[in-house]
């Protein structure tokens, strides 16, 4: 028998520095977690103690903090090289800055293979990107070889900016021939490493003949056997065992997100490459694990540029950006309009001739807006200003909801109107009229939404049974501010970009902004 240790991360999302337990900015260092310096300590400890170790990443290193905003992926290549990753799969967020934003900082700089079998380049891009990412890689590990085959969510064109010269194929269809090829090369230990979410990970384990282990990402799935060490609730045991269609027991793993855990899986193979046993657990990277001093020093060196960036001008406003609680928790506010416009703009994807865009709607809890920006400061807007407006370090996510769920959400928005509570919704691509003289739960008298399947966008009444795409803060997707109906009834949820980054990118793009209050939210006569 031959034993392999798989160490794995996924959805790190730019958490190079240690974070608080909830993966936001580290406040009390003695209780902080994760970060590449601490990860390196644990990885090195395992490498010293065990003979056959692979360190793998299942995608979405890009996007999530000011590190990515400033360094645009160069930080990912640098620190993953320093940690000596063995392989990485492409995630959807790796395409956030377009293909060029993937090629230059990461693909050309990485000293480890970057993989995806279901992304096919065409046209002029095919020769430019050739060899920079691979469908699979055979890695020598001790006296043996292990095949790693990559995959990426086929939804990436809707979630990021891969452009028109990359085709995202069905994962299972694309993986099978690559696995077959590895088999003909006498590689009998094969890991599928990819970024399509836990449901797809399980399907790959079930359907792709010859895959021995699946290491996944995208869904931030936490698996654990026994008593979990922090607040994440396990979605199942680690590893999660899937019985394949040809009768094999295939372990599937994922390690939550944000570099909080290091996945640790031990696999025992027989001489024919069959999995005999698999066991392990994610390792919580808490403060009992010291940060490696050399990596930490490097982080501190790279950090300097971030502090300078915070005070640089991103763009200008020629109007007062009203982010006061007096406005945003009671009525339409132009700061809410600005943020929602930025959220929609960040999700412009012309993927189908029938649609001007795949999503037109945004909702945003007024309580999430925490500061105005005064135009009398020469109109200057900085990252620092935006961090005061959006201080909680969230993401703007894409969800799919039925019209009936949206109606409930808008009723919830005003169910206790007048108490300066945070659930009052700011909107984009939506016209809503409330009648506050009616009883709570029956106050939405008009709800029109901007069409997507149209060449000239116009507002149509919301249909209860139709499924709509909506951009919203992850806080709302998770049921925050009492929006339990969103959490309970959402049909799909894909995590998006860092909130401040979305707004800062929009302001930089527009250069000068002047958002207005324009009648997106109205109160019918006699009620307000």
């Amino acid at each position: 028998a031959w034993e392999l240790t798989i160490l794995h991360t996924n959805d790190v999302h730019s958490r190079l520095e240690q974070t608080s337990e909830d993966s936001s900015k580290c406040v009390n260092a003695s209780r902080c977690m994760g970060g590449v310096a601490r990860l390196f300590t644990k990885v090195q400890q395992i490498r010293r103690a065990e003979p056959n170790v692979l360190l793998l990443d299942a995608g979405d290193q890009y996007q999530g903090t000011i590190w990515f905003t400033v360094y645009k992926g160069a930080e990912v290549a640098h620190f993953m090289n320093a940690l000596r990753y063995d392989a990485m799969a492409l995630g959807n967020h790796e395409f956030d800055n377009g293909v060029e934003g993937l090629i230059e900082p990461l693909l050309k700089e990485a000293k480890f293979p970057i993989l995806s079998a279901n992304i096919k380049a065409k046209g002029p891009l095919a020769s430019q990107i050739s060899g920079l990412y691979l469908p699979y890689k055979v890695l020598p590990v001790g006296d043996e070889v292990v095949g790693i085959v990559g995959y990426t969510s086929k939804e990436t064109p809707f979630l990021s900016n891969p452009g028109t010269n990359l085709v995202f194929e069905d994962e299972i269809t694309a993986l099978q021939p690559e696995v077959d090829k590895l088999k003909t090369l006498n590689v009998n230990k094969i890991i599928a490493l990819g970024h399509s979410g836990f449901e797809m990970d399980k399907l790959i384990a079930q359907k792709v003949r010859g895959v021995d282990v699946v290491v996944g990402g995208h869904s931030n799935t936490f698996l654990y056997t026994g008593n979990p060490p922090s607040k994440e609730v396990p979605a199942g045991k680690y590893p999660f065992i899937v019985t394949s269609d040809d009768g094999r027991k295939v372990p599937v793993v994922q390690a939550y997100a944000f570099g909080k855990y290091l996945g640790y899986l031990k696999i025992e193979f027989d001489e024919r490459g069959n999995v005999i046993s698999s066991h392990g657990n994610p390792i919580l990277l808490n403060s009992s694990i010291p940060e490696d001093p050399s990596i930490k020093a490097d982080i501190n060196k790279w950090r300097i540029k971030l502090d300078n960036y915070s005070t640089q001008e991103l763009g200008k406003t020629i109007v007062y950006l009203d982010g006061s609680s007096q406005s945003c928790r009671f009525r339409e506010c132009n700061m809410g309009n600005l943020i929602c416009d930025a959220m929609i703009n960040n999700n412009l994807r012309h993927t189908d001739e029938m649609f001007w865009n795949h999503v037109s709607m945004c909702i945003l809890n007024g309580g999430g807006i925490r500061s105005p920006i005064d135009e009398r400061n020469n109109g200057t807007i900085t990252w620092e200003n935006l961090a005061a407006v959006l201080p909680f370090g969230g993401t703007f996510d894409l969800v799919q909801l039925k019209g009936s769920t949206l109606k409930k959400a808008f009723e919830h928005s005003v169910h206790r109107y007048g108490q300066s509570t945070g659930e009052f919704l700011q909107v984009g691509g939506i016209h809503v009229v409330y009648d506050l003289s009616r009883k709570p739960g029956d106050r939405v008298v008009k709800l029109d939404v901007l069409c997507t399947k149209c060449r000239v966008p116009s507002y149509d009444p919301l249909k209860m049974d139709e499924v709509y795409k909506v951009i919203l803060p992850n806080f709302l997707a998770n049921g925050g501010d009492g929006f339990q109906m969103i959490k309970d009834e959402l049909l799909r949820h894909d995590s998006g970009d860092q909130d401040i980054n979305v707004v800062s990118t929009y302001i930089s793009k527009m250069k000068v902004i002047y958002p207005a209050v324009e009648g997106r939210i109205k109160f019918s006569t006699g009620s307000h």
């Epitope: 909830d22 009390n28 006061s324 007096q326 928790r329 500061s371 909680f392 300066s420 925050g480």
Partner: antibody, heavy 116, light 105 residues
């Protein structure tokens, strides 16, 4: 994150007192702030809240018209002006960030004793 | 909105499963939090939004309920869990329950 209350002490019925809460380690100006009190050997009683930008204030019925909450975001400070104090206002007074939410932090409290 | 907690005191042993209930005088959706307080200390948030575990709180604590009836469960009591527990609604101006004192049997 640190919240440090001060200004407590002994005061006669009908008298006044001003409590302060000094905040550090977080973006004070981004958080709604509360005062909560606890009479000796008794349970918790919410007193007042002020929104992050100072534009909204709410009070418990038991203190309405007598207590005033205020803040100075430039100084990272929260205040509670207490007038017309009564014996039943005797309590440990805590300042806290957005209670019952993810960003929930409390100070260690300051004791106010109203007695003749 | 009044909050009624029960029981007002409770004796239990290490390893026991303990349940504390809280009833609101009217529907409060999931606007409910649970706090733990030890003598001479500030309250510590355990659960918010009825069932969401606060950062750093052990997973043996869990919350459930919606509307008017809510429950705090400690799956296996540890020595450090003996304290007073309060529920608190934030649907309207905040209001705390009267507290449940959890003592060693």
């Amino acid at each position: 994150v640190q919240l440090v209350e001060s200004g407590g002490g002994l005061v006669q019925p009908g008298g006044s007192l001003r409590l302060s809460c000094a905040a550090s380690g977080f973006t004070f100006s981004s958080y709604d702030m509360h005062w909560v009190r606890q009479a000796p050997g008794k349970g918790l009683e919410w007193v007042a809240v002020m929104s992050y930008d100072g534009s909204n204030k709410y009070y418990a019925d038991s203190v309405k018209g007598r207590f005033t909450i205020s803040r100075d975001n430039s100084k990272n400070a929260l205040y509670l002006q207490m007038n017309s104090l009564r014996a039943e206002d005797t309590a440990v007074y805590y300042c806290a960030t957005e209670i019952a939410a993810k960003g929930d932090y409390w100070g260690q409290g300051t004791l106010v004793t109203v007695s003749s | 909105i009044q909050m009624t907690q029960s029981p007002s005191s409770l004796s239990a042993s290490v390893g026991d499963r303990v349940t504390i209930t809280c009833r609101a005088s009217q529907g409060i959706s999931n606007y409910l939090a649970w706090y733990q307080q030890k003598p001479g200390k500030a309250p510590k948030l355990l659960i918010y939004a009825a069932s969401t575990l606060q950062s750093g709180v052990p997973s043996r604590f869990s919350g459930s309920g919606s509307g008017t009836d809510f429950t705090l469960t400690i799956s296996s009591l540890q020595p450090e869990d003996f304290a007073t527990y309060y529920c608190q609604q934030s649907y309207s101006t905040p209001h705390f329950g009267q507290g449940t004192r959890l003592e060693i049997k």
